[in-house]
């Protein structure tokens, strides 16, 4: 007689990543009886919420519920009804909301209150919405990629199950680029972490990790662009800003009020004799790169070495996974291949930025002009940040792996956040129960 298949004993979890430019909902799934095993949790769905980040709803908080509806409905469809009530839902907001909180704690709280009320209306086990710290964002991104790469597993394997696996237990560093902040997290080699704010200690699966992390607020790609514009308009002789970070022939009118809306441009704020200015692209990579470097203050360092703005950074060590906007931008520019050297990337960026705007629009007709216009800046910014900001070199460039997904799960902080909040990463190596790892039954 045929054996009847037993019902799948699985669990689900939902994490919403409320970023500065958009919100994404991730659904994770794992076998209930293997909760403490490494690498068993995987992403089954990503739903990108249609619209901007939640901080943009500050003047219309009552509409946040509509904004979230579609993806929450998707979660209701994907997760079996019998599991709804025991499925935890977490929302973590990142730098967009950190910036809003800097402007007004009251407004940030109001946005989060409405988010909490909206998410509480669904049949899931809502666990709260909060603004996570930059340190958490870096740490959870590091946990995510190393969990997915199998770096916490104590079992040595003679075969590779994931790309980038170097078959050793040395962890990968994590490079995360968002719209409003960027994070760098890695285990330095026998180096004291000179700044306590940047030091994390973990005990995971029976092993101790001393991790360096820093989140640079205002140095995500969108806020970095606002900073650059605010810096450059200071020295413009009139309301025309000839900008090397935009394609030749590109034109865009910017309101000065929009430029100074973000706390990130406060240091460049001045009274200008005009309310608007026009960006006119000239498409020159080298000049764009030089302009971006002026955002990084490297003249002051109270430690043995720094990244920029007086922030301690130990010598880089090992391989790094670069994800989120690092990946999306480089993927668009077709520069994610392991075989592309840093010199080649620079060469390609020079060519790309020099292409006329009309030509670019024709070549990428399906891409929204706002996004399309900013790839020259974003690509140049990534190179500037990695090379001058974090001190990667032409040689160490090959240790950067631009990663979108690992084993079908997105690289990012959300998985690490959920693993932590559901206590699925034990401090000690779990004892194998009979049959749980056996090949034959």
């Amino acid at each position: 007689t045929q054996n009847k298949a037993l019902p799948e004993n699985v669990k689900y979890g939902i994490v919403l990543d409320a970023g500065s430019s958009h919100t994404s909902l991730y659904i994770y799934k794992w076998p209930a009886e293997k909760e403490n095993d490494t690498g068993v949790v995987h992403q089954v769905e990503e739903c990108r919420v249609k619209g901007p980040g939640i901080s943009k709803f500050v003047q219309k908080v009552n509409e946040i519920g509509i904004y979230l509806t579609d993806c929450m409905e998707r979660a209701r469809e994907v997760i079996p009804r019998s599991q709804h009530q025991e499925t935890p839902v977490y929302l973590g907001a990142t730098a967009g909301m950190r910036l809003l909180r800097m402007e007004s704690e009251e407004l940030a709280d109001r946005v989060l209150d409405v988010v909490e009320r909206s998410l509480s209306n669904y049949p899931f086990d809502f666990q709260g919405a909060r603004i996570i710290t930059g340190q958490e964002e870096g740490a959870y991104g590091w946990i995510t990629i190393n969990y997915l790469l199998g770096k916490f597993s104590q079992k040595t394997r003679w075969f590779s199950i994931v790309p980038y696996e170097t078959n050793n237990q040395e962890t990968f560093g994590a490079l995360d680029l968002g719209g409003a902040s960027t994070q760098v997290t890695f285990v330095p080699q026998n180096q004291t972490i000179e700044s306590p704010d940047n030091a994390l200690q973990f005990r995971l699966y029976g092993k101790d990790y001393n991790v360096y992390t820093h989140s640079f607020l205002c140095y995500g790609k969108d806020q970095a662009l606002w900073q650059k514009l605010a810096k450059d308009i200071q020295v413009a002789s009139n309301e025309i800003l000839r900008d090397p970070c935009f394609h030749p022939g590109y034109k865009k009118v910017v309101n000065v009020s929009d430029l100074y809306k973000t706390p990130c441009t406060k240091r460049f704020e001045m009274t200008l004799p005009f309310q608007q200015f026009e960006i006119q692209g000239i498409g020159n990579y080298q000049q764009c790169h030089q302009s971006i470097l002026e955002l990084f203050n490297t003249s002051y360092c109270p430690y043995s070495q720094c990244a920029f703005n007086g922030i301690f950074l130990p010598p880089l060590q090992g391989d790094f996974g670069a994800f989120s906007a690092f990946y999306f931008v480089m993927k668009f520019l077709n520069l994610t291949s392991e075989k592309v050297s840093q010199e080649k990337v620079t060469e390609m960026m020079k060519k790309f930025c020099a292409q006329p705007w009309e030509e670019i629009k024709t070549s990428y007709a399906g891409v929204k002009e706002k996004y399309l216009s900013e790839y020259c800046f974003s690509g140049t910014y990534i190179l500037s940040l990695l090379l001058q900001g974090y001190h990667f070199t032409a040689d160490s460039w090959e240790h950067i792996h631009f990663i979108g997904k690992i084993q079908g799960s997105d690289a990012g902080w959300t998985l690490g956040y959920m693993l932590n909040l559901t206590n699925m990463i034990p401090a000690e190596q779990p004892l194998s129960t009979p049959l749980s790892h056996s090949t034959y039954v």
Partner: antibody, heavy 121, light 106 residues
Amino acid sequence: EVQLVQSGPEVKKPGATVKISCKVSGYSFTDYNLNWVKQPPGKNLEWIGNIDPYSGGTRYNQKFKGRFTITIDQSINTAYMHLRSLRSEDTAVYYCGLYGYDDDANYFDDWGQGTMLTVSS
Amino acid sequence: EIVLTQSPATLSPSPGERVTINCSASSSVSYMHWFQQKPGTPPRLWIYATSNLASGIPARFSGSGSGTEYTLTISSMESEDFAVYYCQQRSSYPLTFGPGTKVEIK
């Protein structure tokens, strides 16, 4: 601005297949779900289903599941609604549409001009 | 699925008159949206999220309600307001429309 341009009117025989297109411009194709709605002559609007170009995922109204298929061709920013085994009750105007929040959190809702499908022997 | 019922089915107000259209849902919805449609044209979003006027919609229109009962009101009817009005819920799938209320010239 956002524009949705649909293919022209169709006259088909029962049992045939039709493919109606909806070409979109003025926004990033993967940013919003693309919906299809049916409106028989002089009758109510009925939601057929939608597609999320970002993930490729589709949803259908149970009533329209089976003969209706929604697809996209991302390279040309176009969504399609395929309908097979046509019947006379499929005679209707079919609309594509999308809605959501733009970058400044302004709500919008845009529709194509509609495609009249006539099924007659 | 959530079934929407509109009342009345037809209305014949005079210009200047106040008009109220009701939409009732078979189970609770978070928001209601309203569309106006004129012959030979696609529906046009009129009110979104229960009470917000879509871009370019005159202030004589308003929307209200919660749970299962929603209302569209025209404070003073004008000639260009004669059309069919549909309510729609986007709170759960499948998305559903009401059967429409025809506001016709007396």
